[in-house]
C-alpha cells in the first residue's frame, strides 16, 4: 500500500530513509537536457523474497538532442555526494542499512540522473530527520516519521524535532551513536 503523501516537512531539517521497504518506487528522472530512453522504465521497484531484496528495473537517460541510449554508469564518490534523495541531500549511507529484511539499500545513481530523487514510499516506511547545517536539534521525542495506515488511510507520524539556529548539527542514525527513541503517543500527527 503506497503512502498517500510525502513525509512531513520540518523547518530547517531534512529527512532520509536508511533503507527502503519492498514496494517502494523510485521515479526514473533525468536531469535537464536528458530524458528517459524510449521504452525505458518509469520507475525502479524494490522487490524481493524472504532472504533478499533488490531494485527491479533500471533507469536510463539519454540526451534530449540525440537518439543514443546511455549505458549504466556508477559515478565516482565525489559525483555521488551531489545526489539528492527526496527533498534532501543524501549523506553517506550507514553500513547496516541493508541488514533489514524486506528492505532495499539506496540504489546507485545512474548516468544523467536528476538532482532530486522522487520516492513513492509504502506503509511501514520510516524516515529520519536531521537539522541542516547551522541548526541544532531540540528533541521532544523521536526525530523520525513512519508511514502508517489506519481506518483505510495512510498518514505520516509527526517527528518530534525542532531545529534552532545554533551552530551544531544532529546526525542521522548510523552516522553517530543513535539516540534512543522514547516510546509513547506522538504529540501530533500529520494527516495525509
Amino acid at each position: 500500500e503506497l503512502c498517500d503523501d510525502d513525509p512531513p516537512e520540518i523547518p530547517h531539517a531534512t529527512f532520509k530513509a536508511m533503507a527502503y521497504k519492498e514496494g517502494t518506487m523510485l521515479n526514473c528522472e533525468c536531469k535537464r537536457g536528458f530524458r528517459r530512453i524510449k521504452s525505458g522504465s518509469l520507475y525502479m521497484l524494490c522487490t524481493g523474497n524472504s532472504s533478499h531484496s533488490s531494485w527491479d528495473n533500471q533507469c536510463q537517460c539519454t540526451s534530449s538532442a540525440t537518439r543514443n541510449t546511455t549505458k549504466q554508469v556508477t559515478p565516482q564518490p565525489e559525483e555521488q555526494k551531489e545526489r539528492k534523495t527526496t527533498e534532501m541531500q543524501s549523506p553517506m549511507q550507514p553500513v547496516d542499512q541493508a541488514s533489514l529484511p524486506g528492505h532495499c539499500r539506496e540504489p546507485p545513481p545512474w548516468e544523467n540522473e536528476a538532482t532530486e530523487r522522487i520516492y513513492h514510499f509504502v506503509v511501514g516506511q520510516m524516515v529520519y530527520y536531521q537539522c541542516v547545517q547551522g541548526y541544532r536539534a531540540l528533541h521532544r521525542g523521536p526525530a523520525e516519521s513512519v508511514c502508517k495506515m489506519t481506518h483505510g488511510k495512510t498518514r505520516w507520524t509527526q517527528p518530534q524535532l525542532i531545529c534552532t539556529g545554533e551552530m551544531e548539527t544532529s546526525q542521522f542514525p548510523g552516522e553517530e551513536k543513535p539516540q534512543a527513541s522514547p516510546e509513547g503517543r506522538p504529540e501530533s500527527e500529520t494527516s495525509c
Epitope: 495506515m149 489506519t150 481506518h151 483505510g152 503517543r185 506522538p186 504529540e187 501530533s188 500527527e189 494527516s191
Partner: antibody, heavy 118, light 106 residues
Framework: QVQLVQSGAEVKKPGASLKVSCKAS????????MHWVRQAPGQGLEWMGW????????RYAQKFQGRVTVTRDTSISTAYMELSRLRSDDTAVYYC???????????WGQGTMVIVSS | DIQMTQSPSTLSASVGDRVTITCRAS??????LAWYQQKPGKAPKLLIY???SLESGVPSRFSGSESGTEFTLTISSLQPDDFATYYC????????FGQGTKVEIK
C-alpha cells in the same frame, strides 16, 4: 473542553432520506477526522465512514456505498451524515466520533436516535 | 473486511474480580486495536488505543495486551462502575468492531 453535539431524534418513513448534524467545539475542527458509527437497538457498533474535516476527503464502508454521504461545513465546525433510501433496518442510534491522536475515537457525540417506520 | 471475534459475549463477575475479555482479528492489524466501554443509553467511551495504550483519564485497572492477532482487555479489580458492555475495534483497515461483551453482576 471537546464537545460533539448532534441533532435531535427523528422518525422517518421507508424510502426517505436522513441528515444528521454534529457540531464540534473545544478543538480545531479542521485538525481531525470525523467518523460516523451507528448502533441498532440491542446490537453492536457499526462503522459507516469518515471525513477529513480539513480537505473534505471521505471514505465509506462498503455496506453503505451509494447510500451515505458525509460532508462538513468548516465555517460552523459541523459535520453531516446523510443516509438515503431508508429501510426499517436503518433504525439505530447514529453517532459522530472524533478520531484522536491515537487514531481511535476519543470523543463521541451523544447520539441521534432515528426510527424508520411506515 | 477484517472480522473481529470477541469473547465471551456475556461475563458474570463480582466486584474485585479480575476480568479478561478477548478479541481475535481475522488477519494482522498491526496493533491498531482499541477498547471501548458503553453503558445503556450512552455513547461509547475510549479506554485503550493501539492495543495497550491507556487513554488519558482512564483508571489504571484497565489494561490491554496483544499476542499476534489476539488482543486482551483486562480489568485487574472490577469496580461497581465497570459493569457495562465492552467493544474492541480494529482500525488498521476500514474500521470494524467486535460484537461486544456484556459484563454483568454475578
Amino acid at each position: 473542553q471537546v464537545q460533539l453535539v448532534q441533532s435531535g431524534a427523528e422518525v422517518k418513513k421507508p424510502g426517505a432520506s436522513l441528515k444528521v448534524s454534529c457540531k464540534a467545539s473545544g478543538y480545531t475542527f479542521t485538525g481531525y477526522y470525523m467518523h460516523w458509527v451507528r448502533q441498532a437497538p440491542g446490537q453492536g457498533l457499526e462503522w459507516m465512514g469518515w471525513i477529513n474535516s480539513n480537505s473534505g476527503d471521505k471514505r465509506y464502508a462498503q455496506k453503505f456505498q451509494g447510500r451515505v454521504t458525509v460532508t462538513r461545513d468548516t465555517s460552523i465546525s459541523t459535520a453531516y451524515m446523510e443516509l438515503s433510501r431508508l429501510r426499517s433496518d436503518d433504525t439505530a442510534v447514529y453517532y459522530c466520533a472524533r478520531e484522536g491522536a491515537g487514531d481511535a475515537f476519543d470523543f463521541w457525540g451523544q447520539g441521534t436516535m432515528v426510527i424508520v417506520s411506515s | 473486511d477484517i472480522q473481529m471475534t470477541q469473547s465471551p459475549s456475556t461475563l458474570s463477575a463480582s466486584v474485585g474480580d479480575r476480568v479478561t475479555i478477548t478479541c481475535r482479528a481475522s488477519q494482522s492489524i498491526s496493533s491498531w486495536l482499541a477498547w471501548y466501554q458503553q453503558k445503556p443509553g450512552k455513547a461509547p467511551k475510549l479506554l485503550i488505543y493501539k492495543a495497550s495504550s491507556l487513554e488519558s483519564g482512564v483508571p489504571s485497572r484497565f489494561s490491554g495486551s496483544e499476542s499476534g492477532t489476539e488482543f486482551t482487555l483486562t480489568i485487574s479489580s472490577l469496580q461497581p462502575d465497570d459493569f457495562a458492555t465492552y467493544y474492541c475495534q480494529q482500525y488498521n483497515s476500514y474500521s470494524t468492531f467486535g460484537q461486544g461483551t456484556k459484563v454483568e453482576i454475578k
